[in-house]
């Protein structure tokens, strides 16, 4: 007795594709060793097709896949365009040779059922339309014409010519002939169930002279298409259902035992699991729509479905298109955090992971938005301008080859409590969702600025200070110029090494940031923030204004962020006659809803790229003292 | 409702033959999969054969004990499932129970791939 399991009989049709799953016991080993599928020959040899190592043989090539569940003790091989040479005796197993564990497999692949010659053979997807043509001649033109289905010897009436309708088919199935054609009558059948299936007859005329056609309808169930997703990636469900139901509503539901529970529909309607993490755009005027779910869970593994109807509902006899999706727990995609946390006044830093591969692909953030299908407009990018509202407060850090970027958000009030998504130009599989949750602050921030009301005047020396306890102590401390293109560092060194000190004085921690001489281009936010090499804390920032000598009081941007603080005699500055290069990359808001959208917008960054880059200084020079 | 109603059981001879079959009313869409399981008195509910429909391709299981003895068939629209058996031993008395999914996936062996069971039918194998 073999510990592989499968199906013994698999049978299938001509042009059909079969997806063969393979059970084997639950170690270590077996997860790991290869897996082969592989053709029995009459001389006892068993010929390897396709295996988890990579080979594929020639007559498979293009049209199979294995692929290896470890979570699940399955692997299952996907094979495509069937034909009738398919057929035969193969072993689906486990090691390094085919000699291994295995279980035998009998694959059967028939020809389309023929009929006989005057049958006609419609094949459609359930929820469609069938048109049956009955021919007659030109003798029963004015004879009744009418539609049956066979059911065993009797035929029952379908529809007719005196505008006799089944009720089954009330509302479903009409009569006409088409302009001046003599010949034809036409049957349409719309809304099609599965148990429509079968052998109909038309007629025209009555007894031995009476015209007869015969239709085979066969009405078919979706086939899944298999989808094979990696833990904390994303999918994409790209659904048609052609013009018929363009102005109906669409909906994704998720098979869930009998029923197919609504995920997302275009009247509003979300399943709470998904929130934040679902977008449903239309694609254009024929009824095409897709639906991106971010942040794939064990859970989301199952089967879909998209559909249209009035009601934004499943309904039978409605078009479907069906998909199975597979959630491989062996990711490619490090585990980040899900939720972070702020308090209004602070500020959070956000690391996104990205394909460590595609460290020169453009990064983006976006906030998602509930509306009725969930968008994610962008507010910052490598080369996006960050979206009115953020200015002074949001910037986007890079790290090339690191496989992570770092988004700064501060000034943090309740309204920033919501969904975000990390997301880049490049592999599309790579999406991060991120739940902000920003709650009152209940003390001082750790970061305070002083003075509060910044106005340098040109010319002059202008020094502005930061204050930070002593849990800060080890870590670097900056003080960056934000610009629409990131917050360059101002450059800055150290004189002397730090004396290591057993104790901290939470009085005297204080890093400054001089401005000599003041120029006008010096006004602006600047960020004092900390770090650990690539790693970015806290951040606080201020508005400084500047002014000439003779004006009056200036306008002031204050936040409250910023809170004063006392001066203190031990401090890191850094002086600055700071020199900005703004090269601004132009980047309208989009709604990343898939691959394309995305590309999209990354190719029209790709012309604006600036050659700044968030976190370089080039321009600027300083000292500290 | 969902009724899954299974017919066919009686008592036999060893050697003999039989035919069960099952017919499912008020599933809600086409089974995607149907299965035979059994149970004899003081044993648990054990796995027999199963079919599963996708698309156009049909799948059929056997249990290693069955294998070449019985032979499972069905239709998918009619929701209707069949079990042939054939050279039918002593050890395969026990109640037999029809069971169906709406959904094909889970393995096919355990009980949990299963949402729907009929009341059952009792096969006896006198020797």
């Known amino acids: 007795q073999s510990p592989i399991f499968g199906p013994q009989d698999v049978s299938s049709i001509e042009g059909n594709s079969v997806s063969i799953t393979c059970y084997y016991p639950d170690t270590s080993v077996n997860r790991h060793t290869r897996k082969y599928w592989c053709r029995q020959g009459a001389n006892g040899y068993c010929a390897t097709l396709i295996s988890s190592n990579g080979y594929l043989s020639k007559e498979y090539s293009g049209r199979a896949s294995l692929i290896n569940f470890p979570e699940n003790s399955t692997f299952v091989i996907n094979i495509a365009h069937l034909t009738q040479e398919d057929t035969g005796s193969y072993k689906c197993g486990l090691g390094t040779t085919n000699r291994g564990l295995f279980f035998d497999v009998s694959l059967e692949v028939s020809q389309v059922p023929e009929f006989p010659n005057d049958t006609h053979v419609y094949t459609k997807d359930i929820g469609r339309t069938v048109t049956i043509e009955c021919r007659f001649k030109e003798g029963n033109a004015h004879s009744k014409k009418s539609l049956c289905k066979k059911r065993g010897e009797a035929c029952e009436v379908v529809i007719d010519s005196t505008e006799y309708v089944d009720p089954s088919y009330k509302d479903r199935a009409i009569l006409f002939m088409k302009g001046t054609s003599r010949d034809i009558f036409y049957v349409n059948i719309s809304h099609l169930i599965p148990s429509d299936a079968g052998l109909y007859v038309c007629q025209a005329g009555e007894g031995p002279s009476a015209d007869k056609n015969n239709a085979d309808l066969q009405v078919l169930e979706p086939e899944p298409e298999l989808l094979y997703k990696d833990l904390r990636s994303s999918v994409t469900f790209e659904c048609d259902l052609g013009r018929e139901v363009a102005n109906d509503a669409k909906y994704l539901c998720r098979k869930n035992k009998e029923t197919c529970d609504v995920i997302i529909n275009t009247l509003g309607k979300r399943d709470p699991a998904f929130e934040g993490r679902i977008l449903l755009t239309p694609r254009d005027d024929n009824g095409r729509f897709s639906v991106l779910i971010t942040g794939l869970r064990k859970e989301d593994a199952g089967h879909y479905q998209c559909g249209a109807h009035s009601s934004g509902l499943p309904q039978e006899g409605w078009p479907v298109q069906a998909w199975q999706l597979f959630v491989n727990e062996e990711s490619t995609i490090p585990n980040s955090r899900s939720v972070v946390k702020g308090v209004t006044g602070g500020s959070v830093a956000i690391v996104c992971p990205y394909n460590p591969k595609e460290s020169s692909s453009l990064k983006y953030w976006c906030h998602w938005e509930a509306d009725e299908n969930g968008r994610c407009p962008v507010l910052v990018g490598t080369q996006a301008l960050v979206q009115e509202g953020y200015e002074g407060r949001l910037a986007l850090f890079d790290q090339p080859g690191s496989g992570a970027y770092t988004v700064i958000l501060n000034q943090l009030t309740t309204q920033d409590s919501g969904f975000y998504w990390c997301l880049t130009d490049g592999d599309s599989r790579w999406r991060t969702t991120i739940e902000l949750q920003v709650a009152e602050a209940t003390k001082k921030p750790d970061l305070e600025v002083t003075p509060q009301n910044a106005t340098a005047v040109i010319g002059e020396t202008f020094t502005i200070s930061c204050h930070y306890p002593c849990k800060f102590y080890s870590q670097e401390k900056y003080w960056c110029k934000w610009s629409n293109d990131g917050c360059h560092i101002l450059p800055s060194h150290d004189e002397g090494a730090r004396q290591s000190s057993v104790s901290c004085d939470q009085s005297s921690q204080i890093v400054s940031m001089t401005l000599n001489p003041v120029k006008k281009e010096d006004e602006g936010w600047y960020w004092c923030g900390v770090k650990e090499g690539q790693v970015y804390g806290e951040t606080t920032a201020i508005y400084v204004a500047v002014e000439e000598r003779t004006r009056g009081s200036p306008h002031i941007n204050p936040t409250d962020a910023n809170a004063r603080a006392k001066d203190a005699p031990e401090e890191e500055a850094m002086e600055s006659s700071v020199r900005e290069d703004e090269n601004k990359a132009n980047l309208d808001p989009r709604l990343f809803a898939d691959e394309r959208e995305i590309q999209n917008a990354g190719d029209q960054a790709q012309e604006n790229r600036a050659s700044g880059n968030a976190g370089s200084a080039g321009g600027q020079s300083g000292s500290s003292k | 409702e969902v009724q899954l109603v299974e017919s066919g059981g009686g008592v036999v001879q060893a050697e003999d033959s039989l035919r069960l079959s099952c017919a499912a009313s008020?599933?809600?869409?086409?089974?995607?999969?149907m299965g035979w399981f059994r149970q004899a008195p003081g044993k648990e509910r054990e796995f027999v054969a199963a079919?599963?429909?996708?698309?156009?391709?049909?799948?059929?299981y056997y249990a290693d004990s069955v294998k070449g003895r019985f032979t499972v068939s069905g239709d998918n629209a009619k929701k209707t499932l069949d079990l042939q058996m054939k050279d039918l031993k002593p050890e395969d008395t026990a109640v037999y129970y029809c069971?169906?999914?709406?959904?094909?996936?889970?393995?096919?062996?355990?009980?949990?791939?299963?949402?729907?069971w009929g009341q059952g039918t009792q096969v006896t194998v006198s020797s």
């Open positions: 008020g599933l809600p869409f086409s089974s995607s999969r």
């Open positions: 069971a169906a999914h709406p959904d094909y996936y889970g393995d096919p062996r355990t009980s949990g791939a299963y949402r729907y």
């Open positions: 079919i599963g429909w996708s698309g156009r391709s049909t799948y059929k």
